[in-house]
Amino acid sequence: HTAAQDNCTCPTNKMTVCSPDGPGGRCQCRALGSGMAVDCSTLTSKCLLLKARMSAPKNARTLVRPSEHALVDNDGLYDPDCDPEGRFKARQCNQTSVCWCVNSVGVRRTDKGDLSLRCDELVRTHHILIDLRHRPTAGAFNHSDLDAELRRLFRERYRLHPKFVAAVHYEQPTIQIELRQNTSQKAAGDVDIGDAAYYFERDIKGESLFQGRGGLDLRVRGEPLQVERTLIYYLDEIPPKFSMKRLT
């Protein structure tokens, strides 16, 4: 079935509306914002999640009074256009007709242009480097224990097979997780590394996308692994096209 049958919810995506109106009275869930049906037995695509996030009422989150020194982090958020499969459309435009090309994880890979900008294909992000800094601990984590625990986490929580976790590097307090997935490697039913990385990023920030699943409690041999900061780097199968003036 596509969702939790007993109470008709979507365990892998809380940003959905579910009702028992599927074939044979089965539970069917639709993503907020797009209204697209989602498969609740796997991760929802990042494009649909971003769209849902942008459509969610801004006051739906718990309000916290920020300190006067707080900086705004917009997370590079925008309201994306998704194709019928839930993937990012290669060309994204905002309401003021400014357009740009994105990769398969929705990150801009060209300079911004106008409506005449062409993005011939959706370029695949085949290598993701997740750079984490953990809070101080009594001692360094054992590298092989950390490696095994992170691979297990991606398999158990994000449905990503360990074969796509290319490496786990560790130099206290920095942990780097390398995800690699070429087009040829990705079989039907395989979770996309971009989607897994996005779910992981939201979990690390304490903004879990799962419904009724506890928050991320990552432990290595019983010792909690608490992340202070996260940086994610994306490498595309075709290098991005930015003008030289952007690089100076």
Epitope: R151, R155, F210
Partner: antibody, heavy 120, light 107 residues
């Protein structure tokens, strides 16, 4: 001591249904991915279904997809396999297995098995 | 679907001998391979996973090797309790598939 006790097997007619159960003990059931594997009368091993630790993700081969459903009740330490539209080729010994914590689909403990015979 | 081909289908050996069973995958499975032992009338038992890692409690006379498409299980100095059937299984994604088995008999 890890124990996996299957039950629910028996003789069933083609097109019929059967629900297998597996009572687990001796380990933290809710922390482990679990699978069902069957062994045909010719002694071939065939993977049937897998469910992750909290029951969100399930996996099946094409041969049983849409006919078999794996589920679990972590409060009862029990794994289930609901089988419907049974065919003669489903005749086998069905084993409940625990997936190795770090072994990614390698099965480190197997139950004693429960026999399923599909015949008219 | 990845096909697993085991050889030989059966072999006879004596206590104290060293035997090797091989398993070939129809495509590259890197090191995602497990080996199981099944004694007559019993359930299978995990011996090796990730091609070469011995499961808990498995005697050191068993060793796994190989990567990519060719793998082997070696049993040094066969003991009476080692006779039975051996199966390989890839764990490189879904669907999981097993080899047809190798029956190891006492000569």
């Amino acid at each position: 001591e890890v124990k996996l006790d299957e039950s629910g097997g028996g003789l069933v007619k083609p097109g019929g249904s059967l629900k297998l159960s597996c009572a687990a003990s001796g380990f933290t059931f809710s922390s482990y991915t679990m699978s069902w594997v069957r062994q045909t009368p010719e002694k071939r091993l065939e993977w049937v279904a897998t469910i992750n630790s909290d029951g969100i993700y399930t996996y099946y081969p094409d041969s049983v997809k849409g006919r078999f459903t794996i589920s679990r009740d972590n409060a009862k330490n029990t794994l289930y396999l609901q089988m419907s539209s049974l065919k003669s080729e489903d005749t086998a010994m069905y084993y409940c297995t625990r997936v190795h914590y770090y072994g990614y689909d390698a099965m480190d403990y197997w139950g004693q098995g429960t026999s399923v015979t599909v015949s008219s | 679907e990845i096909q697993m081909t085991q050889s030989p289908a059966s072999l006879s050996a004596s206590v104290g001998e060293t035997v090797t069973i091989t398993c070939r995958a129809s495509e590259n499975i890197y090191s995602y391979l497990a080996w199981y032992q099944q004694k007559q009338g019993k359930s299978p038992q995990l011996l090796v996973y990730s091609a070469k890692t011995l499961a808990e409690g498995v005697p050191s006379r068993f060793s796994g090797s190989g990567s990519g498409t060719h793998f082997s299980l070696k049993i040094n100095s066969l003991q009476p309790e080692d006779f039975g059937s051996y199966y390989c299984q890839h764990h490189y994604g879904i669907p999981l598939t097993f080899g047809a088995g190798t029956k190891l008999e006492l000569k």
